[in-house]
């Protein structure tokens, strides 16, 4: 049976820690969850669409010369979509002009690891979060966000990159995962499903949510994204699940109301600046954290994932708008743009709160709780 949906303020059912998890049924999307292929774990480190701007924006991710300045978000590859549950393999599609790191599709050929070896790495994302197995880490303090309340001007670029809808963020959005773990927000994008089919990338005890937001950050220790790729903690992504609620979400409406203007792949528009923090859950103190990867080629590892325990509520109409407005490559709707969950391979998912205690309705057999790796920080 499936874990009931998390309520906006209730725990996600607890925290999941990464036990050594062979690639099992629950690591792959169920048939109803994902109709396409997924990619296997990967191994190296390259940028990926989901966490970075669009892959299609640059045929290749290469460092710019001094004269050109630092690599921009838009210059990086973007995230791709998921594939058939029957085939635990995320395939990437090389575009016509296609360079090895340009356009990807969920479910296309060749397989992602062939395009980017990193996609076959051992510590990939997304993963299934099992609250009962999460390691409670009191050292994980509430996240700190500074400068996320943007004024309406200057406007921001909202783009359909063929894999997702991406909002490029201006300089000045600072995020701290803790003391000395400081980041700058670069962009945000969404992952979703289709009518009646959920499309979050992460899952909770196998339960997939309707959609998921990712806010991608670069560590302040690095001046450029290409320098941070594959470096532990070089990139950090804040992720939150979106689910259906009774009311329209006015923060999301500022973006969703503009999707018709960018229905076509590769199109973009400008939107007024908004309160980016309003797109995230209000509780910054309860979350799960683990080290993984970008969820699309180049599947670079070393990415710190922070998945909020609290969900964000959107109306049914808004979720429908998200999943039914945009078009992707080859005259196909941009839908089900999520990668299958990947094996933990011994990773431990940490929780900032005692997620495994009294929170999961499925606790049948006793479980061995993992210990917190960050204890004493």
């Amino acid at each position: 049976q499936r874990l009931p949906r998390m309520q906006e303020d209730s725990p996600l059912g607890g925290g999941s820690s990464g036990e050594d998890d062979p690639l099992g049924e629950e690591d792959l999307p169920s048939e109803e969850d994902s109709p396409r292929e997924e990619d296997p774990p990967g191994e190296e480190d390259l940028p990926g669409e989901e966490d970075l701007p669009g892959e299609e924006d640059l045929p290749e991710v290469k460092p710019k010369s001094e004269e050109e300045g630092s690599l921009k978000l838009e210059d990086l590859p973007t995230v791709e979509a998921p594939g058939d549950p029957q085939e635990p393999q995320n395939n990437a599609h090389r575009d016509k002009e296609g360079d090895d790191q340009s356009h990807w599709r969920y479910g296309g050929d060749p397989p992602w690891p062939r395009v980017s070896p990193a996609c076959a790495g051992r510590f990939q994302s997304p993963v299934d979060i099992r609250p009962q197995l999460a390691a409670f880490c009191p050292a994980l303090r509430p996240l700190e966000l500074l400068g996320f309340q943007l004024p309406p001007l200057p406007e921001l670029r909202l783009r359909n990159n063929g894999h997702s809808v991406q909002l490029t963020l201006p300089p000045g959005l600072e995020m701290a995962l803790g003391p000395g773990r400081e980041y700058r927000a670069l962009q945000l994008h969404l992952h979703w499903g289709a009518a009646g089919r959920p499309g979050s990338e992460h899952t909770v005890e196998g339960h997939r949510f309707p959609a998921e937001i990712h806010v991608v950050h670069l560590s302040t220790a690095f001046a450029r994204v290409d320098e941070a790729l594959g470096r532990p903690g070089g990139l950090a992504v804040l992720a939150a699940f979106l689910e259906e609620g009774p009311e329209e979400n006015s923060a999301y409406e500022q973006l969703l109301s503009r999707l018709e203007e960018i229905a076509e792949e590769g199109s973009e528009t400008q939107v007024p600046g908004l309160d980016i923090s309003a797109l995230l859950p209000s509780d910054f103190s309860r979350y799960f954290q683990y080290e993984g990867s970008l969820t699309t080629p180049p599947c670079a590892q070393g990415v710190i994932w922070t998945v909020f325990n609290q969900t964000v509520m959107l109306s049914a109409k808004q979720l429908h708008t998200l999943s039914d407005t945009l078009w992707g490559p080859g005259d196909s709707r941009l839908q089900l743009n999520f990668r299958a969950t990947q094996p933990l391979n011994g990773r431990v998912i940490e929780a900032s709160f005692p997620a495994g205690v009294d929170s999961s309705p499925r606790a049948a057999e006793p479980v061995q709780l993992n210990s917190c790796l960050a204890a004493g920080d």
Partner: antibody, heavy 124, light 107 residues
Framework: EVQLVESGGGLVQPGGSLRLSCAAS????????MHWVRQAPGRGLEWVAF??????????QYSASVKGRFTISRDNAENSLYLQMNSLRAEDTAVYYC???????????????WGKGTTVTVSS | DIQMTQSPSTLSASVGDRVTITCHVS??????LSWYQQKPGNAPKLLIY???NLHTGVPSRFSGSGSGTEFTLTIGSLQPDDFVTYYC?????????FGQGTKVEIK
């Protein structure tokens, strides 16, 4: 002195067209978002359209009530703003104001300079 | 669209009075609100921007306050010139919307 002067208003039949012009002076025209705002007789103010500044690519934005019928444009060499109005309806009858609002240093849209307005009457 | 509701629609007062006009906004717009004054037959003039900042050349008897969804325009001591119509406007997102106006008339 910063100034906006509208022209081109008049009487037109429903379904007809009209082109409004606005001559701007006294400021760096390309730095600013430029708007058209209208006011129907005895009514309140209604924003119609804007065109972005140079930094934002001079792209337009329209209110739902005029989208597809009106086209805003600008001639930066002439410091002029235009509003091409097609398929006019009786409800488009109003005083049309050319308005300056928003630039590289602004943090939101407020309308700090207004022209005197030009009257458009749509009637058969 | 963001809805703007001004109250009262008409306000009767005397010279020297302190008056307050309220603008209620249908959703949170932070401080992205402006106030305008319009005299009959003339174009509107900007009085207050960003909820509380006085535009250049505007007399100090005018002041603005508020944030989120509730805003006020206060005229500290009404002068004969002030018996006209006032509008609030949100600049958070387009379509930009105005309140329906408040007419200040002589009692």
């Amino acid at each position: 002195e910063v100034q906006l002067v509208e022209s081109g208003g008049g009487l037109v039949q429903p379904g007809g067209s009209l082109r409004l012009s606005c001559a701007a002076s006294g400021f760096t025209f390309t730095d600013y978002y430029m708007h058209w705002v209208r006011q129907a007789p005895g009514r309140g103010l209604e924003w119609v359209a804007f065109i972005r500044n140079k930094a934002s690519g001079y792209t337009p934005q329209y209110s739902a009530s005029v989208k597809g019928r009106f086209t805003i444009s600008r001639d930066n060499a002439e410091n002029s703003l235009y509003l091409q109005m097609n398929s006019l309806r009786a409800e488009d009858t109003a005083v049309y104001y050319c308005v300056r609002g928003g630039h590289a240093g602004s943090n939101y849209w407020y309308f700090d300079v207004w022209g005197k307005g030009t009257t458009v009457t749509v009637s058969s | 669209d963001i809805q703007m509701t001004q109250s009262p629609s008409t306000l009767s007062a005397s010279v020297g009075d302190r008056v307050t006009i309220t603008c209620h906004v249908s959703q949170n717009i932070n401080v992205w609100l402006s106030w305008y004054q319009q005299k009959p037959g003339n174009a509107p003039k900007l009085l207050i921007y960003q909820a509380s900042n006085l535009h250049t050349g505007v007399p100090s008897r005018f002041s603005g306050s508020g944030s989120g969804t509730e805003f006020t325009l206060t005229i500290g001591s009404l002068q004969p010139d002030d018996f006209v119509t006032y509008y609030c406007q949100q600049g958070q997102s387009y379509p930009f919307t105005f309140g329906q106006g408040t007419k200040v008339e002589i009692k």
